[in-house]
């Protein structure tokens, strides 16, 4: 007997989708071997329709896929737009179709129920609105119009033109009789319930001359859309509930084991603490649609999610909903990166951000998650070189190490920098990730002077002290601009106006500018790195003034403990523009900083990953 298991019989109707889950023993061989879905022909051969190696037959093109979940020993075959031709005998299996492990599945696709002749079918999701059209002849124009619901052999009056309304439909039904000449009346039912499902009868007049029309109302529990996302990645739920509820509070909730639905986020300001720092509810469009983005997906995020509208901001019977079943794939393409990065006040952090390596040319962004109201994420920096004004001189996004990872460096840290930040690109939205910056007790490892004033035409020497533990690291000085941090040439690159020399014995790396020019004014960073992986940085601002006294200026090491001017993120930042979540800017405040000097020449950034979950900043 085969150890592969699945549904022996699957039945559906034309136009629907099926999602067939097959189970296999999750041995290491089974986990990585080929998975397939094939159709058994008259000859007994089984023709592959879709496989885990990417093959999709022409018959299934654009409507089927196979997703493997190796960590729990399952794979799922999704087939959409079913037709009666899809009825037949299939196998789901592992390895080679003709031998190996498989399970027989019978798929039956039917036409749907038989209905009385001339029956109009209305298929509507629960919570939505239906308009039933009821034609009549001229002689019945002045007579009573009514809608009945057929329950077994009896007909129950639902509404009529004499103002009767069945209590089950109170406050959500109306009968409209148009002006003269239009031989049709309509019945509008709002906020449909599952119990409204069934056969209805429109009637105009009475006796043998009455007009009748059958209507079959199919109220559907919204079929959950199956969503498969990678661990650590991101999911977006797009929720379109219709204009009828455009001005009603919206929510996303998750169905729990008690079959109630716990609010994850709503437009009334409620948010589940489990999603702190990693969820945004996108502003509504005019049509009332909205979307919710969740990043940093965890295995425990799996489950059934519903979005809906109700004035209470939570699930209520008879209001429109949309449903998803979220599966989180543990065999993720998204690499592990620290979810928490620690730094000390005055110090720095270097954050590694993953992106889809197939999209190396995509624009990279970093934004600060703000939890107020529905959450927003104003952009702080992007790879094109725009940096928020408040972060001038202390924030840089660098393309290194590349190949699926970029780096963001933030220095001159204050307690107000603690919080959640998102890494994102203008490409694959599933690669959005979240990192939390924590400010802990401690002293920065790199020490530079607080302020430096250089004199035009003279020599400036700025010291940067580093501890012994960085002796094996590469030390560098760079000049910050809003496009990066241009590394300054080291002494062995030959004579230069600006060069770096390092005295290992005194654990000092000094920046020398000779002679000082107006263009030298600006922010300079001292930093350490290992290859393309950047460690800590310290920043110093150099102001340039006219010559007053002859001689060169040397900033003595004694001044190195002076604190740099702190730049604090103003909480009352003027909001320029709110953009929809589909825009990678995530409602960024687009304040553009003028270029402050040298263009970055490929200098980039990195992280010291002390563990897979936390990466150290200046707190080593």
């Amino acid at each position: 007997k085969s150890p592969v298991f699945g549904p022996q019989e699957v039945s559906s109707v034309e136009g629907n989708s099926v999602s067939i889950k097959c189970y296999y023993p999750p041995t290491s061989v089974n986990r990585h071997t080929r998975k397939y879905w094939c159709r058994k022909g008259a000859s007994g051969r089984c023709i592959t329709l879709v496989s885990s190696e990417g093959y999709v037959s022409s018959n299934y093109a654009g409507r089927a896929n196979l997703t493997n979940f190796p960590e729990n020993g399952t794979f799922v075959v999704n087939i959409a737009q079913l037709s009666r031709d899809d009825s037949g005998h299939y196998k789901c299996g592992l390895g080679i179709n003709s031998r190996g492990l498989s399970f027989d599945v019978s798929l039956e696709v039917s036409q749907g129920p038989e209905l009385p002749n001339g029956t109009e079918v209305y298929t509507v999701d629960v919570g939505r609105t239906v308009t039933i059209k009821c034609p009549f002849k001229t002689e019945n124009a002045p007579k009573t119009k009514a809608l009945y619901k057929k329950i077994g052999q009896t007909s129950v009056l639902v509404i009529d033109s004499r103002n009767y309304v069945n209590p089950n439909y109170k406050d959500r039904i109306r009968l409209r009789i148009p002006g003269t000449g239009q031989l049709i009346f309509t019945v509008v039912i709002d906020r449909l319930r599952l119990s409204d499902h069934g056969l209805y009868l429109c009637q105009a007049g009475d006796g043998s001359n009455r007009d009748e029309k059958n209507a079959d109302l199919q109220v559907l529990e919204p079929e959950p859309e199956l969503v498969y996302e990678d661990l650590r990645g991101s999911v977006t739920f797009h929720c379109a509930l219709g204009l009828e509820v455009a001005n009603v509070a919206k929510f996303l909730c998750r169905v729990n084991s008690r079959e109630t639905c716990d609010v994850v986020i709503n437009t009334l300001g409620k948010r589940d603490s489990a999603f702190e720092g990693r969820i945004l509810l996108n502003p509504q469009d005019k049509d009332g649609s909205f979307s919710v983005v969740i990043t940093g997906l965890r295995k425990e995020d799996e489950g059934r999610y519903l979005c809906g509208a109700h004035s209470d901001g939570q699930l209520q019977e008879g209001w429109p909903i949309q449903a998803w079943q979220l599966f989180v794939n543990e065999e993720s393409t998204i690499p592990r990166s620290p979810t928490v990065v620690k730094g000390v006040a005055g110090g720095s952090v270097a954050v590694l951000c993953p992106y889809n390596p197939k999209e190396s040319q995509s624009l990279k962004y970093w934004c600060l998650w703000e939890g107020a109201q529905n959450g927003r994420c104003p952009l702080l920096v992007e790879s094109q070189g725009l940096v928020q004004e408040q972060y001038e001189g202390r924030l840089s996004l660098l393309q290194e190490p590349g190949n699926g990872t970029f780096t963001v460096i933030l220095n001159q840290l204050t307690t107000q920098d603690a919080g959640f930040y998102w890494c994102l690109t203008n490409g694959d939205t599933r690669w959005r990730t979240t990192v939390e910056i924590k400010i802990i007790e401690g002293e920065p490892n790199l020490k530079v002077p607080g302020n430096v004033t250089a004199v035009l035409g003279e020599t400036l020497n700025i010291p940067c002290h580093f501890p012994c533990k960085f002796s094996s690291y590469e030390k560098y000085w760079c000049k910050w601009s809003n496009t990066g941090c241009q590394t300054l040439p080291s002494q062995d690159e030959g004579p230069s106006e600006a060069f770096v020399n390092c005295d290992e014995n005194s654990r000092l790396v000094s920046l020398t500018l000779n002679p000082v020019t107006r263009a030298d004014e600006g922010w300079y960073w001292c930093g350490v790195k290992q290859g393309h992986f950047y460690g800590e940085t310290a920043a110093v601002y150099v102001a340039v003034e006219e010559k007053k006294v002859a001689g060169s200026r040397y900033v003595s090491p004694a001044k190195a403990d002076a604190a740099p001017d702190e730049k604090v993120l103003d909480s009352g930042v003027r909001e320029i523009e709110n953009k929809a979540i589909q825009d990678p800017r995530l409602f960024a405040e687009e304040k553009v900083v003028a270029d402050t000097g040298d263009q970055a020449g490929g200098s980039r950034a990195s992280v010291d990953s002390s563990s897979s979950e936390e990466q150290g900043g200046s707190s080593k």
Partner: nanobody
Framework: QVQLVESGGGLVQAGDSLRLSCAAS????????MGWFRQAPGKEREFVTT??????????YYADSVKGRFTISRDNAKNTVYLQMNSLKPDDTAVYYC?????????????????WGQGTQVTVSS
């Protein structure tokens, strides 16, 4: 909460048929699957069959030991699941439990089910 009530059990001869019913009441709206397990004296509870659904699509799972003999079906309007048992054998003697789940990862695993009925005795004599 969801309440499940089984009925239809009894004493039959080998080769006979029996039909079990399981009526669900309460908050059945988000119920995703219902099935049958059985437990013979001194043995562990074992999977028999389950039906899961999504809209108008149904998925039926059967244990190898009952394939071709037992059939599961459901009446959506009545919130009821039926188990038609044909060609019964003495080995089928057990207490049959109805179970319901809101999210089902593996229909064969009893712990995946959130709600259980009290059980109905089926005895097949030779």
């Amino acid at each position: 909460q969801v309440q499940l009530v089984e009925s239809g059990g009894g004493l039959v001869q080998a080769g006979d048929s029996l039909r079990l019913s399981c009526a669900a009441s309460g908050r059945t709206r988000t119920t995703y699957g219902m099935g049958w397990f059985r437990q013979a004296p001194g043995k562990e509870r074992e999977f028999v069959t389950t039906i899961t659904w999504s809209g108008s699509t149904n998925y039926k799972y059967y244990a190898d030991s009952v394939k071709g003999r037992f059939t599961i079906s459901r009446d959506n309007a009545k919130n009821t699941v039926y188990l038609q048992m044909n060609s019964l054998k003495p080995d089928d003697t057990a207490v049959y439990y109805c179970a319901a789940s809101t999210v089902l990862t593996d229909p064969r695993v009893p712990t995946e089910y959130d709600y259980w009925g009290q059980g109905t005795q089926v005895t097949v004599s030779s």
